[in-house]
């Protein structure tokens, strides 16, 4: 790992993996075990990142990168590089301080995690409610009533299937 | 546990030399800087050499670079500093240390220290 | 050589208070800054490494802050086992140096 001197700064050239060791008279050394260096001219190799207990490891570290994290099953990842792991809840669901909490009525929540958000208000933009909300679902908004006057053309739903072998009564 | 254990205090004449060691355990002796500090009554600390032990790569302070030696024997995970031409001034508490991560450059575990003391 | 100089070179303070200690290098030493308590007959020990970074095992309330050639040594709240001399080192350039000290005493 030794490297030519740099005029400038003696640790310039010492690659990613390795320091410049002051030890050593600024040669460049590896970075030791669970450490590394992203880039070159460092005097220094951070520590390996440690994916425990709730985190579990995605990417190992090596003398160039930093190990990445995610979460165990039941868990998603929060902030930046997956800072923290926070516990999955079920679709219609929320996480509170409390545990895992049902959405109130008029609220929906389709993911594991975030929090339960009102149904969209279709009158707002001037439409109906085509399908009604769930704590899983959102409202479907269907055509605006006007959309729906005499010599409109509107969409209606398909007649219901008849059983075979069946007449109507 | 981490553990540097020094040898006893020494009482020497002026231009005879002192060999103080230093027992390691409970880490990968070869794995980490061995360095030497003094300390003179009611005075500072002030850094004298440091040794690998893997490769016996030292850097010695200019300041004692003619009298001072250190040594390890990886065998027994011991280091050694020797120091000659004592005189009166070189009256200190002679600590090892280990240096932690290689490039912090921090003092992390230390020995109890062995008195030297330079008297005619 | 690089100089360390500490003050103030003594200190008097009383149980709680907040203790600040400051280390200047004569040089830019990047964050290569080390803190150390050495208590009567005892050898130093590390409580801050790297500026910032507290070393393993060591209270909360003992804090580093700083970069290049100013640097500064807190503790929060003052407990009667503080009592000791603390020591500044810098880590960038062979020779490794020492600060003189700030010893701290009880009000």
């Known amino acids: 790992f030794e490297r030519t001197r740099s005029l400038q700064d003696p640790c310039s050239n010492c690659p990613a993996g390795t320091f410049c060791d002051n030890n050593r008279n600024q040669i460049c050394s590896p970075c030791p075990p669970n450490s590394f260096s992203s880039a070159g001219g460092q005097r220094t190799c951070d520590i390996c990142r440690q994916c425990k207990g709730v985190f579990r490891t995605r990417k190992e570290c090596s003398s160039t990168s930093n190990a990445e994290c995610d979460c165990t099953p039941g868990f998603h990842c929060l902030g930046a590089g997956c800072s923290m792991c926070e516990q999955d809840c079920k679709q219609g669901q929320e996480l509170t301080k409390k545990g895992c909490k049902d959405c109130c009525f008029g609220t929906f929540n389709d993911q594991k995690r975030g929090i339960c958000r009102p149904w969209t208000n279709c009158s707002l933009d001037g439409k109906s409610v085509l399908v009604n909300g769930t704590k899983e679902r959102d409202v479907v908004c269907g055509p605006s009533p006007a959309d729906l006057s005499p010599g409109a053309s509107s969409v209606t739903p398909p007649a219901p299937a008849r059983e075979p072998g069946h007449s109507p009564q | 546990q981490v553990q540097l254990v020094q040898s006893g205090a020494e009482v020497k004449k002026p231009g005879s030399s002192v060999k103080v060691s230093c027992k390691a355990s409970g880490y990968t002796f070869t794995s980490y800087w061995i360095n030497w500090v003094r300390q003179a009554p009611g005075q500072g600390l002030e850094w004298m050499g440091n040794i690998y032990p893997s490769d016996t790569y030292t850097n010695y302070n200019q300041k004692f670079k003619d009298r001072v030696t250190i040594t390890a024997d990886k065998s027994t995970s011991t280091a050694y500093m020797e120091l000659s031409s004592l005189r009166s001034e070189d009256t200190a508490v002679y600590y090892c240390?280990?240096?932690?991560?290689?490039?912090?450059?921090?003092?992390?575990?230390w020995g109890q220290g062995t008195l030297v003391t330079v008297s005619s | 050589d690089i100089q360390m100089t500490q003050s103030p070179s003594s200190l008097s303070a009383s149980v709680g208070d907040r203790v600040t200690i400051t280390c200047r290098a004569s040089?830019?030493?990047?964050?290569?800054l080390n803190w150390y308590q050495q208590k009567p007959g005892k050898a130093p020990k590390l409580l801050i490494y790297?500026?910032?970074r507290l070393h393993s095992g060591v209270p909360s309330r003992f804090s580093g802050s700083g970069s290049g050639t100013d640097f500064t040594f807190t503790i929060s709240s003052l407990q009667p086992e503080d009592i000791a001399t603390y020591y500044c080192q810098q880590g960038h350039t062979l020779p490794y140096t020492f600060g003189p000290g700030t010893k701290l005493e009880i009000k």
């Open positions: 240390a280990r240096m932690g991560d290689p490039f912090y450059y921090a003092v992390d575990y």
């Open positions: 790297y500026t910032s």
């Open positions: 040089q830019d030493i990047s964050n290569y």
